[in-house]
Amino acid sequence: QQQTLPKPFIWAEPHFMVPKEKQVTICCQGNYGAVEYQLHFEGSLFAVDRPKPPERINKVQFYIPDMNSRMAGQYSCIYRVGELWSEPSNLLDLVVTEMYDTPTLSVHPGPEVISGEKVTFYCRLDTATSMFLLLKEGRSSHVQRGYGKVQAEFPLGPVTTAHRGTYRCFGSYNNHAWSFPSEPVKLLVTGDIENTSLAPEDPTFPADTWGTYLLTTETGLQKDHALWDHTAQNLLR
C-alpha cells in the first residue's frame, strides 16, 4: 500500500531571484483532488491553502507582496489527498536581490574571443562580501560561485561557442541576500567560421526583462519551469 503521494513541484514566479520590495508568487503543483497544500519556510509551516473545488485544481499560489531579507530562504511544499500526504517538494531557494550595492563585471581578455581562448570573468564589489555569483542568462540559467575579499575570479577555461551569451554577477551577503546585478557583459565567441561572431545558444532577452530577473521568456510546462529553476538553485547549494 502506498504510504505517500508523489512530491509536488515548487517554483517562484516570475523568478526565484526577487528584487527587494517587489512581489513574488510561490507556486506548488501537486495532483488534482488535493484538499490541502502546505508551504514550509526554513523547516516551519508558513502558509496553508485549501483549493476549491479540489478535483479541478492541481496548483496553488502563495503570494508575497513585498520581498525582503526575512522572506528569503528555503521553501518547500507538500499536499494532501484525503488523509494521505505527499513527499515534500524539492527545496526552493528564494533570493532577495538589490541589496546595498552594485558589483562590476569584466572579462579577460575581452568580450570578443575565439573558440579555445582562455576566458576569465571578474566580479568586483568593494563592500563587505566575500561570496560572488556569476549567472549566464538563458533557459539553463547557469550559476557559478566564487570567493574573494573584494573580487572573485571565474575562470571559464578555454571557451567554446556554448559559452557565448550574456553574463551578470552579484555579490552575496548570505546565501539568500544578493546585491544589485552588475551591468551585463555579452561574451561573443567566434567558432571556426571566418570572422563570424555567433549568436548566443540559449534564448536571451531584451535587456529590460532582466529588471524582473526573468531568465526565460516562455513558461512552457510548469514542470519544465520548475526543473530549470532547480538546476540553478542546486548550483547555489
Epitope: T104, L105, H108, G110, V113, I114, E117, Y122, R124
Partner: antibody
Framework: QVQLVQSGAEVKKPGASVKVSCKAS????????MHWVKQAPGQGLEWIGE????????NYNEKFKRRATMTVDKSISTAYMELSRLRSDDTAVYYC??????????WGQGTLVTVSS | DIQMTQSPSSLSASVGDRVTITCRAS??????LNWFQQKPGKAPKLLIY???RLHSGVPSRFSGSGSGTDYTFTISSLQPEDIATYFC?????????FGGGTKLEIK
C-alpha cells in the same frame, strides 16, 4: 572612431620617474583591457602589462613588475603607465593598445621617453 | 615566458615577389598567433590574427598559416607599400611575447 592619443615625448634623468598617458575615445573605455608595450630604438616589442579600466585589475610582465605601475582615470577615459627608477635602457617608445576584437587592433601613436644624464 | 623566434631578421625582395617569413614558438601556442606590420615612426598595425584570419581592411595578398609551434606569414605579391618591419606575436599565454621582427626591403 576608436582613438588612443598619447602624451608627448619626455626627457628624463636616470633615477627619475615618467608617467605616460593614453586618452581613449570611440569605445566603452571600461570594457576593454588597456595594454602597454615598449619598443627600444631599433628593437622589437615588449609587453609591459595590461589594466582593466572597469575594476583596476592588472597583469604585469614579471620583468616590469617592480618598476611599472598602470592606473586609469575612468572619469576622463585615460590610462597611465608610470615607470620609476629610470635607467638608460628604458629609452624607448611606449605604446598603449587595446584588443577590441581578437588581438591588439588599436594602438596609440607612441610616446618617446629618453633617459639621459 | 614563451620565446618567439622569427626568421629571417631582414629580407630583400622585388616588387611582385612572393615573400615568406617564419615564426617559431618555444612551445605550442594553439594557433593564437598574430602578425603585425610596422612602418618607421608609426605604431604596429594588426594584419593577421589567430594564425590565418585577415584583420578588417587588410589586403588579401597577406596570409598566414601554421599550427603548434611553427607559423608562416606570406605576401603573395610584394607591393612597394609593404616595405616595413613585420612581427609575430603569441597570445596563448601571459605574458604575450613578440618575435624579434623581420625588416623587409625592396631590391
Amino acid at each position: 572612431q576608436v582613438q588612443l592619443v598619447q602624451s608627448g615625448a619626455e626627457v628624463k634623468k636616470p633615477g627619475a620617474s615618467v608617467k605616460v598617458s593614453c586618452k581613449a575615445s570611440g569605445y566603452t573605455f571600461t570594457t576593454y583591457w588597456m595594454h602597454w608595450v615598449k619598443q627600444a630604438p631599433g628593437q622589437g616589442l615588449e609587453w609591459i602589462g595590461e589594466i582593466n579600466p572597469g575594476n583596476g585589475g592588472t597583469n604585469y610582465n614579471e620583468k616590469f613588475k617592480r618598476r611599472a605601475t598602470m592606473t586609469v582615470d575612468k572619469s576622463i577615459s585615460t590610462a597611465y603607465m608610470e615607470l620609476s627608477r629610470l635607467r638608460s635602457d628604458d629609452t624607448a617608445v611606449y605604446y598603449c593598445a587595446i584588443r577590441l576584437r581578437f588581438a591588439l587592433d588599436y594602438w596609440g601613436q607612441g610616446t618617446l621617453v629618453t633617459v639621459s644624464s | 615566458d614563451i620565446q618567439m623566434t622569427q626568421s629571417p631578421s631582414s629580407l630583400s625582395a622585388s616588387v611582385g615577389d612572393r615573400v615568406t617569413i617564419t615564426c617559431r614558438a618555444s612551445q605550442d601556442v594553439r594557433n593564437f598567433l598574430n602578425w603585425f606590420q610596422q612602418k618607421p615612426g608609426k605604431a604596429p598595425k594588426l594584419l593577421i590574427y589567430f594564425t590565418s584570419r585577415l584583420h578588417s581592411g587588410v589586403p588579401s595578398r597577406f596570409s598566414g598559416s601554421g599550427s603548434g609551434t611553427d607559423y608562416t606569414f606570406t605576401i603573395s605579391s610584394l607591393q612597394p607599400e609593404d616595405i616595413a618591419t613585420y612581427f609575430c606575436q603569441q597570445g596563448n599565454t601571459l605574458p604575450p611575447t613578440f618575435g624579434g621582427g623581420t625588416k623587409l626591403e625592396i631590391k
